[in-house]
């Protein structure tokens, strides 16, 4: 299941591999899928202290 290209990009890269607009990279099976198929972590409550967000899997510009 863990096949495909590895990226050497840093923690703050917007996505580890190019996906077409409206697609996001599924880190667990390592391919591009519709962003709506992936569930993001629960949002932090307002004012909660937490490390700065890292790799955000957003659609590619």
């Amino acid at each position: 299941m863990r096949r495909g290209p590895r990226s050497l990009r840093g923690r703050d890269a917007p996505a580890p591999t190019p996906c077409v607009p409206a697609e996001c990279f599924d880190l667990l099976v390592r391919h591009c899928v519709a962003c709506g198929l992936l569930r993001t972590p629960r949002p932090k409550p307002a004012g909660a202290s937490s490390p700065a967000p890292r790799t955000a899997l957003q659609p590619q510009e």
Epitope: R6, D12, P16, L28, G36, R39
Partner: antibody, heavy 117, light 111 residues
Framework: EVQLVESGGGLVQPGGSLRLSCAAS????????WNWVRQAPGKGLEWVGY???????YYNPSLKSRFTISRDTSKNTFYLQMNSLRAEDTAVYYC???????????WGQGTLVTVSS | DIQMTQSPSSLSASVGDRVTITCRAS??????????MHWYQQKPGKAPKLLIY???DLESGVPSRFSGSGSGTDFTLTISSLQPEDFATYYC?????????FGQGTKVEIK
């Protein structure tokens, strides 16, 4: 808020079969990853496998030949079919869903499966 | 499979103590600049509860006395000031490579 409710546990004889159900509410099982995790009495957690948004399944290789995960999207429910059960399969079985990093942030309450003659 | 080894297996501590639990993976669980390492708390008869994901990100609603650190193969869960409700068993988990695997658990008991 995702809620998960397991059912189907109980006593089964060695060599028998059982199907566990996990009914999800608050999100569709056609998105994300939907897991089974088990815990033998007094022991640690063991990942059984998952079914994801596309219906793709992946299993712990030690269990794959006997366990099958499936889903019914119309009921928003996924299942764990367990065959050729052994005493060592006695455990509490949890269903859980994970976010895109694999961390399981919502869990069911667990259902006990006892394999004994 | 990636083997996860937690230490210690159990520990006794008092309310207010600083507690550190370590988890070592048999190979790196980092990929794409992300550590696929998570920490859970479990109390008897209850389902596990996610505390930390991606090595150091605090799950929503989890008290800030919990923190995580590490990368590669070595990770740490720290409770800065142990509270009565923190007596439980803690598990690490990796989701870098299938099959996903858990550590054997660390039981935190009252001294």
């Amino acid at each position: 808020e995702v809620q998960l409710v397991e059912s189907g546990g109980g006593l089964v004889q060695p060599g028998g079969s059982l199907r566990l159900s996990c009914a999800a509410s608050g999100d569709s099982i056609t998105r994300g990853y939907w897991n089974w995790v088990r815990q033998a009495p007094g022991k640690g957690l063991e990942w059984v496998g998952y079914i994801n948004y596309s219906g793709t399944t992946y299993y712990n290789p030690s269990l794959k030949s006997r366990f099958t995960i499936s889903r019914d999207t119309s009921k928003n429910t996924f299942y764990l079919q367990m065959n050729s059960l052994r005493a060592e399969d006695t455990a509490v079985y949890y269903c859980a869903t994970n976010h895109l990093y694999g961390a399981m942030d919502y869990w069911g309450q667990g259902t006990l499966v006892t394999v004994s003659s | 499979d990636i083997q996860m080894t937690q230490s210690p297996s159990s520990l006794s501590a008092s309310v207010g103590d600083r507690v550190t639990i370590t988890c070592r993976a048999s190979e790196s669980v980092d990929d794409y600049g992300i550590s696929f390492m998570h920490w859970y708390q479990q109390k008897p008869g209850k389902a596990p509860k996610l505390l930390i994901y991606r090595a150091s990100d605090l799950e929503s609603g989890v008290p800030s006395r919990f923190s995580g650190s590490g990368s590669g193969t070595d990770f740490t869960l720290t409770i800065s000031s142990l509270q009565p409700e923190d007596f439980a068993t803690y598990y690490c988990q990796q989701t870098s490579k299938d099959p996903w695997t858990f550590g054997q658990g660390t039981k935190v008991e009252i001294k």
